[in-house]
């Protein structure tokens, strides 16, 4: 890794699970500088591998509200509008951040999670499975 | 919103920035249960959108790495395995919360950042404007 | 606990239109998807249509040109509109909750809730 | 659209004995990128509307007792019944979930001897 110079007017850490436990300052900074609105908005509907959104709330979790995408069809739309099941309809993933609560429902005591969400759906070609 | 009754074992915190500075436990939990090994990993070749992924790293961030995705071409790959300009490849794109060390360089003192990457492509019928 | 109530009128004339309610209690609209299916007298089950968590629709293209499926979710109800029915068209119609699966990424076509049915006659 | 084939259309069964349908599909209900077979089975009692016995072959719905069990994989699968009990009479159908328009099997109608 990349070492770098402390910073000397960094605040102090006498805890003893340091460098495990960090002050984060949730006052979130937004450095989305596209500033398209309209982004993804409608893809998931113009895609030849259509999704739908389902929210996923957690109370426990921040941030609480997630959006899961589920692609609509196992096959693709061709150009005629129908499910073509020549072509397979696939979710792409990522693994997101998220903070939860620990211990739980503690306002200011977090733990960093990792989770894998689901966020559209592409199309691709399927997996021929040869049989010996 | 849900309101959830507090721990009476939470951490104390008489920080005069309370609730907007939080203590954050650094070991990550994994709640990936979804142990499909293969997920998204072929699709950006599979796909009749796809992309290439970049390495972005930044050691002022938590991640340092992400990858961003970057889609091949402007149109989508059609059954003869051609580009076809008819259609349009775009990127998904999802907001995601890192942390960004403040004031930079601290190893132990974080804010909050949303920042828009680019997971994958897929593959949408365009948008037809009309010349009035 | 789930449940669907289907409801609307017992008798239909030829080439009127077919209107029936489905109200459910019990689960997150926003969640779950809605589909419509049929069984004609002493016959099997046949799929009208679904409408998803997000208002959008899709139809068995045998209906298509005279299906309406639509949601009101301040009512908890969901509609089914089938035009120009004939004889044919004579069936007990259930609405049906899709089953939601978290950490599945598709759409889910079995349904694990039914209504009770409601039989529709259509005759002059 | 996918044809659904059911036999026995009608089986007569003795209280305490097995008992197995057959359901076969017009093409693979298999999809090949999470290795999942899209076929449910259904029983609908008399009276009553259908209820989902077991999803993706062989995933019994929550309730349903464990006397029953599912099979199969691409056009070809079975529902078992390890010991048939009075209450488990009715029409069963199996359904795919792959290929839209979601289609159903006649049916097999089970019943006591």
């Known amino acids: 890794g990349i070492t770098i110079p402390r910073n000397p007017g960094c605040p102090n850490s006498e805890d003893k699970n340091f460098p495990r436990t960090v002050m984060v300052n949730l006052n979130i900074h937004n450095r989305n500088t596209n500033t398209n609105p309209k982004r993804s908005s409608d893809y998931y509907n113009r895609s030849t591998s259509p999704w739908n959104l389902h929210r996923n709330e957690d109370p426990e979790r921040y941030p609480s509200v997630i959006w899961e995408a589920k692609c609509r069809h196992l096959g693709c739309i061709n150009a005629d509008g129908n499910v073509d099941y020549h072509m397979n309809s696939v979710p792409i993933q990522q693994e997101i951040l998220v903070l939860r609560r620990e211990p739980p429902h503690c306002p200011n005591s977090f733990r960093l999670e990792k989770i894998l969400v689901s966020v559209g759906c592409t199309c691709v070609t399927p997996i021929v499975h040869h049989v010996a | 919103g849900i309101t959830i009754p507090r721990n009476p074992g939470c951490p104390n915190s008489e920080d005069k920035n309370f609730p907007r500075t939080v203590m954050v436990n650094l070991n990550i939990h994994n709640r990936n249960t979804n142990t499909n090994p293969k997920r998204s990993s072929d699709y950006y070749n599979r796909s009749t959108s796809p992309w290439n992924l970049h390495r972005n790293e930044d050691p002022e961030r938590y991640p340092s790495v992400i990858w961003e995705a970057k889609c091949r071409h402007l149109g989508c790959i059609n059954a003869d395995g051609n580009v076809d300009y008819h259609m349009n490849s775009v990127p998904i794109q999802q907001e995601i919360l890192v942390l960004r060390r403040e004031p930079p360089h601290c190893p132990n003192s974080f804010r909050l950042e949303k920042i828009l990457v680019s997971v994958g492509c897929t593959c949408v019928t365009p948008i037809v404007h009309h010349v009035a | 606990q789930v449940q669907l109530q289907e409801s609307g009128p017992g008798l239909v004339k030829p080439s009127e239109t077919l209107s029936l309610t489905c109200t459910v209690s019990?689960?997150?609209?926003?969640?779950?998807?809605v589909s419509w299916i049929r069984q004609p007298p002493g016959k099997g089950l046949e799929w009208i249509g679904i409408i998803w968590n997000n208002g959008g629709t899709d139809y068995q293209s045998a209906f298509k040109s005279r299906v309406t499926i639509s949601v009101d979710t301040s009512k908890n109800q969901f509609s089914l509109k089938l035009s120009s029915v004939t004889a044919a068209d004579t069936a007990v119609y259930y609405c049906?909750?899709?089953?939601?699966?978290?950490?599945?990424?598709?759409?889910?076509?079995?349904?694990?809730?039914w209504g009770q049915g409601t039989l529709v006659t259509v005759s002059s | 659209d996918i044809v659904m084939t059911q036999s026995p259309l009608s089986l007569p069964v003795t209280p305490g004995e097995p008992a197995s349908i057959s359901c076969k599909s017009s093409q693979s209900l298999l999809f090949s990128e999470n290795q999942k077979n899209y076929l449910a089975w259904y029983l609908q009692k008399p009276g009553q509307s259908p209820q989902l016995l077991i999803y993706w072959t062989s995933t019994r719905q929550s309730g349903v007792p464990d006397r029953f069990s599912g099979s199969g994989s691409g056009t070809d699968f079975t529902l078992k019944i390890s010991r048939v009990e009075a209450e488990d009479v009715g029409v069963y159908y199996c359904?795919?979930?792959?290929?839209?328009?979601?289609?159903f099997g006649q049916g097999t109608k089970v019943e006591i001897k």
């Open positions: 019990g689960f997150s609209l926003p969640s779950h998807s």
């Open positions: 359904q795919q979930s792959y290929y839209t328009p979601y289609t």
């Open positions: 049906a909750r899709n089953m939601y699966i978290t950490d599945y990424y598709y759409e889910n076509y079995f349904m694990d809730a």
